[in-house]
């Protein structure tokens, strides 16, 4: 016989998912429409691309490289599918309500789903955390919540510090770490006797999480570039998002063979670190002047990185609950710090050279940005955390964690729960 | 040579619409931002839209947005201005202008600049009842 | 929105007098200012980017300097075709893009 949800979940996911559907079919009709402005077609081919760069990242990079797990390796694939279709409409709405809303309506545009796309990604990113610990339904709060937070984050930012697209996407690193670090730290940690093994990974989710990680690899100089002002700014941030990321492969297979007492590789501390030097460099991706300082960049941001697979998953484990397998969250946390210090130090660079204190101004401007994106991501970690410890949701008992079997149909096993 | 042509100007009723457009030539109009600036008789310029290369992007004045929207077709290069819901402090002279970018570097940054090197020779846009 | 503010607003002078013109912003934009010329019934003109960068074929009489918020338009020696008006715009917001309200220069 095949597993099945609890009943109360059965009755509760369907109409809460696809209540929310609805509603969001509602707000598109009411308040959305496309852009009609004329685009030329090899443009808008162009344009997509970058779009669809994106997508390939957040379906299949994050959804395999988070794939890992003995026995949750179909669960989180699919829900993070899930998660991403959900977070793109949502997202698509909430950045027109911020932004265009007084106009009257939300115009639609291929650039305005780039944006919808990367604001999902965090959520995916954040997701890494609690993935096997939690149902759809409550994933289904997760999304909405933090899109909201991060999206509220960005209207701040823009509003207050003057900052541009590329640069308040850039806290999405930091945000997606602490947010999904703070929701970890409010749901139930201790894994019950007997269930130790199903937050192992295997060998063939192993690979699919490798597959991810290649996915992430390939695509990261989209991500960087996506949303920079103009083609000398964006070939200058795939270009150095290209060369960090390749000389973070090469550290963190050698640094993981380094670190292993008989010298053996990590899968798990390669799958997270070869995407080490892209989120390093992702604020000051454009900024960089020459390869050998993005080649820098992705040295040291390998090494942090194997660095903090080898140290912190024993004190995320006992304080967080998070397995040791799930490390995009402090990983992100470090690098995503390391990324906003490197672009600190620019600042303070061109102060001193400068001898101008409005610069300087410019250097406590951004560490105020940075420190409201960590707190914004705390608070409403900590409330999402909150929210999804409430008894409506039904979630999984602990005996349950990192179980396909509670969500899925496998016809061909015989195990009942 | 590099050559930009502002057409679709005239007299209008207030609340009418009007389409402005601007012909490039002598240069790859696709790697270009493009703007349009207008000014008022007797008065200066003021920046009113926006527009980045692949046409992915759009800011607007506080002064236009919601009546305004830029557009541009690269196959034709061609930029656009459709204008709606006119009104009389409208009436003013609009030039299209192509935003050049340039950079220079230190050892450890690069700085990006961004300014307006080609301008049309301008339409003049008059709301009246 | 950041917002330019020009001093003087209009200004008297000489051929061969020394000029200078300033522009300050309402908040910090580093060295991304630029200066343009208008002539009367004609299209402005781009005389000087990143505050102090001359646009190639403006003779070099003209200078520009100045970073964060304060910025001067020096013309060194007037000629009789510098009689015009001089516009500063700040690039370093990517949403708004400012003018000043514009210094008209005279002729004495």
């Known amino acids: 016989m095949s597993s099945k949800y609890p009943r109360s979940v059965r009755r509760c996911l369907p109409l809460w998912a696809l209540t929310l559907e609805a509603a969001l079919i509602l707000l598109f009709y009411f308040f959305t429409h496309y852009d009609a402005s004329l685009e030329d077609q090899k443009g808008l081919v162009a344009s997509y691309q970058v779009g669809q760069d994106l997508t390939v990242m957040a379906a299949i990079g994050l959804g395999f490289l988070t794939s890992s797990f003995r026995r949750h390796s179909w669960s989180s694939v699919a829900f993070n599918l899930f998660m991403l279709a959900l977070g793109v409409q949502w997202a698509i709405l909430l950045d027109g309500f911020l932004s265009q809303f007084p106009s009257g309506k939300v115009v639609i545009t291929l650039f305005s789903i780039r944006l919808a796309t990367m604001s999902a990604l965090s959520v995916l990113i954040s997701v890494d955390a609690v993935l096997g610990k939690v149902n759809l339904a409550q994933l289904v709060v997760m999304v909405l919540v933090e899109v909201t937070a991060l999206g509220n984050l960005r209207m701040v930012i823009s509003n207050i510090f003057n900052t541009d697209y590329h640069m308040n996407m850039m806290h999405i690193y930091v945000f997606a770490a602490y947010f999904g670090l703070s929701v970890a730290w409010c749901l139930p940690k201790p894994l019950p006797e007997g269930t130790e093994d199903k937050d192992q990974t295997a060998t063939i989710p192993s690979l699919s999480a490798m597959l991810g990680a290649l996915f992430l690899w390939m695509f990261w100089p989209s991500f960087n570039s996506a949303l920079l002002r103009s083609p000398i700014e964006r070939k200058n941030a795939v270009f150095n998002t290209y060369y960090a990321v390749a000389v973070s492969v090469v550290t963190a297979i050698s640094g993981s063979s380094l670190a292993h007492p008989q010298g053996k590789i990590s899968k798990t501390y390669v799958h997270s670190a070869v995407l080490a030097g892209g989120v390093a460099v992702g604020t000051s991706c454009h900024l960089i002047p020459s390869p050998w300082l993005a080649m820098v960049l992705g040295l040291v941001a390998g090494l942090i990185s194997v660095g903090g697979a080898k140290y912190l998953p024993g004190c995320c484990n006992r304080v967080l609950g998070i397995p040791h397998s799930s490390i995009m969250g402090y990983n992100f946390s470090l690098l995503g710090l390391l990324g906003e210090i490197i672009y600190i130090v620019l600042l303070v660079l061109d102060t001193v050279g400068a001898g101008n204190g409005m610069i300087g101004f410019q250097v406590l401007l951004s560490i105020g940005e940075l420190s409201l994106a960590i707190v914004i991501a705390l608070m409403s970690g900590l409330l999402t955390g909150l929210l999804l410890n409430l008894k409506i949701w039904k979630a999984p008992h602990e005996a349950k964690y990192f179980d396909d079997q509670v969500f899925w149909k496998f016809p061909h096993l015989a195990v009942g729960f | 040579q590099v050559q930009l042509v502002e057409t679709g100007g005239g007299v209008v009723q207030p609340g009418r619409s009007l389409r402005l457009s601007c012909a490039a030539s002598?240069?790859?109009?696709?790697?270009?931002?493009m703007h349009w600036v207008r000014q008022a008789p007797g008065k200066g310029l003021e920046w009113v839209a926006v527009?980045?290369?692949?046409?992915?992007?759009?800011y607007y004045a506080d002064s236009v947005k919601g009546r305004f929207t830029i557009s541009r077709d690269n196959s034709r290069n061609t930029l656009y201005l459709q204008m709606n819901s006119l009104r009389a402090e409208d009436t003013a002279v609009f030039y299209c202008?192509?935003?050049?970018?340039?950079?220079?570097?230190?050892?450890?940054?690069?700085?990006?600049?961004?300014?307006?090197?080609?301008w049309g020779q301008g339409t003049t846009v008059t709301v009246s009842s | 929105d950041i917002q330019m503010t020009q001093s003087p607003s209009s200004l008297s002078a000489s051929v061969g007098d020394r000029v200078t013109i300033t522009c300050r912003a309402s908040?910090?934009?580093?060295?991304?200012l630029n200066w343009y010329q208008q002539k009367p019934g004609k299209a402005p003109n781009l005389l000087i980017f990143?505050?102090?960068t001359l646009q190639s074929g403006v003779p070099s009489r003209f200078s520009g300097s100045g970073s964060g918020t304060d910025f001067t338009l020096t013309i060194s020696s007037l000629q009789p075709e510098d009689f015009a008006t001089y516009y500063c715009?700040?690039?370093?917001?990517?949403?708004?893009?400012?003018f000043g309200q514009g210094t008209k220069l005279e002729i004495k």
């Open positions: 202008a192509r935003e050049q970018g340039g950079y220079s570097s230190s050892w450890y940054r690069r700085y990006y600049y961004y300014y307006m090197d080609v």
């Open positions: 002598g240069f790859t109009f696709s790697s270009y931002g």
């Open positions: 527009i980045w290369s692949d046409g992915s992007n759009k």
């Open positions: 908040q910090s934009i580093s060295s991304w």
């Open positions: 990143a505050a102090s």
């Open positions: 715009q700040q690039s370093y917001s990517s949403s708004v893009y400012t």
